[in-house]
Amino acid sequence: KFSKQSWGLENEALIVRCPRQGKPSYTVDWYYSQTNKSIPTQERNRVFASGQLLKFLPAAVEDSGIYTCIVRSPTFNRTGYANVTIYKKQSDCNVPDYLMYSTVSGSEKNSKIYCPTIDLYNWTAPLEWFKNCQALQGSRYRAHKSFLVIDNVMTEDAGDYTCKFIHNENGANYSVTATRSFTVKDE
């Protein structure tokens, strides 16, 4: 089936896009797959649907499950599935593999690390970046829009990078973190 895995941490915001894309004018209905119960669109709910987006503000472990989105055009209905898993926050610094986004490679000439999923959120700069849980400091590191740029990349720059930002929804702020590995390749 047309399905997409999404994951997040409890007490953080998680926004999921219906994997079945449609034209902006098409309506999208969201359901809990197990119960076929409709997900409300009212923003006062902690979990609510907003067009192609399903918003968990904030997410809870019990939100884990499969969600169905049905995109409706005047003549076609197309179904997608979002497989959502919400994990408990780790007490230690290690980010487990199941929370990692895809690995990116960089070199001396090209060292952009994109903050995963950030385009789904209503955030404002600056992004905070961490490597192996340490806040990145120094002139070699530049947070530029949704990227981290590392100047003069070295082998030691390889590791796990976490971006942290705030999602704003109707005046309320929610934290979001996302982690991915960075590897350094020789030119």
Partner: antibody, heavy 123, light 107 residues
């Protein structure tokens, strides 16, 4: 009612050129991706080319790449296929069709088709 | 490109019988697969989209199933007007490709 009407087919010599037109009506032409599909006599269907709606991005089958050009005039609700360097194997009925859904980077089915126009390449 | 192989090439059946047509993809197309019906001298007509959804106005005797690489079009009880050629088409990626067709003929 959605209607697609092809024209411009005919007999042409190998190496020659032809321009097919498809006049669309009954829907907001500019927001839909449009497609050319052909069918050689007694054979199956072959996708030829697609063009995005307002963005105008184009896609071609390897068999026609570099020889055929798809275009559209949204102000005239018309789709075109300019066919150059025609070969005998291009002989087919050419259909224009509408993709009712697709978003950037994706494709969908063809829900409305024209009646087709016959292109014969022969000396 | 993704190759779609339809079987059988020809299906000889009587009105009222059940028709089962197969379409196999050379690689997974998820459920991005459609079925069309074409009668002589006519343009194809969309029957099924997203592997199992009937297009508007298509009778309930037509049903589609499958996902990934193996798909089936079933006509539960053939009507005289159902004798035609049927094509599957994938639209997960360009180039869009069609199967070679299955002809359903009167026995």
């Amino acid at each position: 009612e959605v209607q697609l009407l092809e024209s411009g087919g005919g007999l042409v010599q190998p190496g020659g050129s032809l321009r097919l037109s498809c006049a669309a009506s009954g829907f907001t032409f500019s927001i839909y991706d449009m497609i050319w599909v052909r069918q050689a006599p007694g054979k199956g269907l072959e996708w030829v080319s697609s063009i995005r709606g307002e963005g105008g991005g184009t896609y071609y089958a390897d068999s026609v790449k570099g020889r055929f050009t798809i275009s559209r005039d949204n102000s005239k609700n018309t789709l075109y296929l300019q066919m150059n360097s025609l070969r005998a194997e291009d002989t087919a009925v050419y259909y224009c069709a509408r993709d009712p859904w697709s978003t950037e980077g994706s494709f969908f089915v063809l829900d409305y088709w024209g009646q087709g126009t016959l292109v014969t390449v022969s000396s | 490109e993704i190759v779609l192989t339809q079987s059988p090439a020809t299906l000889s059946l009587s009105p009222g019988e059940r028709a089962t047509l197969s379409c196999r993809a050379s690689q997974s197309v998820d459920d991005d697969l459609a079925w069309y019906q074409q009668k002589p001298g006519q343009a194809p007509r969309l029957l099924i989209y997203d592997a199992s959804n009937r297009a508007t106005g298509i009778p309930a005797r037509f049903s589609g199933s499958g996902s990934g690489t193996d798909f089936t079009l079933t006509i539960s009880s053939l009507e005289p007007e159902d004798f035609a050629v049927y094509y599957c088409q994938q639209y997960i990626t360009a180039p869009l490709t069609f199967g070679q067709g299955t002809k359903v003929e009167i026995k």
